[in-house]
């Protein structure tokens, strides 16, 4: 047995609409039936929670109703989408995966995905 490895892309550029998607993949040491995925944002030395979801293997991820995150799972991969991002949200987004059930518990923390967000330029006024 050893620590659970979590892999995620190093860099992602958000779309002009402020949407960023990335895959969080974990090497499951066992046959987990209940998994919890948390997205953390690190800025400077502060780490804050962006969103979290617990799901049963084979089922959809359920975030809180007003969460800025959505996601789908496929095997040991979780496809995460964060929306509503602005330039000030640029930072390192860390994927944390916990195998909650059955025991034993495993916790894996990725190295983070640097998400760059560029606010769109306002459209110039049209002169007719």
């Amino acid at each position: 047995c050893k620590a659970m490895h979590v892999a995620q892309p190093a860099v992602v550029l958000a779309s002009s609409r402020g949407i960023a998607s990335f895959v969080c993949e974990y090497a499951s040491p066992g046959k987990a039936t209940e998994v919890r995925v948390t997205v953390l944002r690190q800025a400077d030395s502060q780490v804050t929670e962006v969103c979290a979801a617990t799901y049963m293997m084979g089922n959809e991820l359920t975030f809180l109703d007003d969460s800025i995150c959505t996601g789908t799972s496929s095997g040991n991969q979780v496809n995460l989408t964060i929306q509503g991002l602005r330039a000030m949200d640029t930072g390192l987004y860390i994927c944390k995966v916990e195998l909650m059930y059955p025991p034993p518990y495993y916790l894996g923390i990725g190295n983070g995905t640097q998400i760059y967000v560029i606010d769109p330029e306002p459209c110039p006024d049209s002169d007719f």
């Epitope: 050893k2 948390t38 804050t48 929670e49 909650m100 034993p104 518990y105």
Partner: antibody, heavy 117, light 108 residues
Framework: EVQLVESGGGLVQPGGSLRLSCAAS????????MSWVRQAPGKGLELVAA????????YYPDTVKGRFTISRDNAKNSLYLQMNSLRAEDTAVYYC??????????WGQGTLVTVSS | ENVLTQSPATLSLSPGERATLSCSAS?????MHWYQQKPGQAPRLWIY???KLASGIPARFSGSGSRNDYTLTISSLEPEDFAVYYC???????????FGGGTKVEIK
């Protein structure tokens, strides 16, 4: 049954050093994050160090960073806390705690560290 | 740093009364854990994932809340419930958090 047994506490002078040990049994030690949590007399709980399962990553609050070092020996099912440059404010009961699915789910009985001249 | 503020610091109640303990987080978390500690003893996990009772915890205890505000409720206090209760985030990055300052439930 999960068991965590701390040892190594005692009286030490300011500026001195101490090494705490935690012997773990009853679970697969090398897959769990482990931590040290302290409690000063009459005060609340403070997380002072944590370490990932293979020992490659460690975490400290600013209050102890640079003075305390957490380590583990998975072959011996043991957790350690090396404390250097000790100060009076480090006086506390030090608990070894396992971080499991429901947070810190198992705790040792604690070992008292007293820093005084 | 996500600061947890527990209130009140002390709650003076009689056996049979209802106790409501609050924990407020400076930034949002999805789950909260609660620990009970009695004098001379190590803390013990009491409620996890906001509302789930740890093994052996009586049903008079309950937990609720979301995001920044969480509550531990004891419906009818028993003599053995008088202790200090601490909250700690059950999500986010656990090793960068501090415990709440604690609420002492004492006999009136």
């Amino acid at each position: 049954e999960v068991q965590l047994v701390e040892s190594g506490g005692g009286l030490v002078q300011p500026g001195g050093s101490l090494r705490l040990s935690c012997a773990a049994s009853g679970f697969t030690f090398n897959i769990y994050y482990m931590s040290w949590v302290r409690q000063a007399p009459g005060k609340g709980l403070e997380l002072v160090a944590a370490i990932n399962p293979d020992g490659g990553n460690t975490y400290y609050p600013d209050t102890v960073k640079g003075r305390f070092t957490i380590s583990r020996d998975n072959a011996k099912n043991s957790l350690y806390l090396q404390m250097n440059s000790l100060r009076a404010e480090d006086t506390a009961v030090y608990y070894c705690a396992r971080y499991g699915g429901p947070g810190f789910d198992s705790w040792g009985q604690g070992t008292l560290v007293t820093v005084s001249s | 740093e996500n600061v947890l503020t527990q209130s009140p610091a002390t709650l003076s109640l009689s056996p049979g009364e209802r106790a409501t303990l609050s924990c407020s987080a400076s930034s949002s978390v999805s789950y909260m854990h609660w620990y009970q500690q009695k004098p001379g003893q190590a803390p013990r996990l009491w409620i996890y994932d906001t509302s789930k009772l740890a093994s052996g915890i009586p049903a008079r205890f309950s937990g609720s809340g979301s995001r920044n505000d969480y509550t531990l409720t004891i419906s009818s206090l028993e003599p053995e419930d008088f202790a200090v209760y601490y909250c700690f985030p059950g999500s986010g990055f656990p090793f960068m958090y501090t415990f709440g300052g604690g609420t002492k439930v004492e006999i009136k």
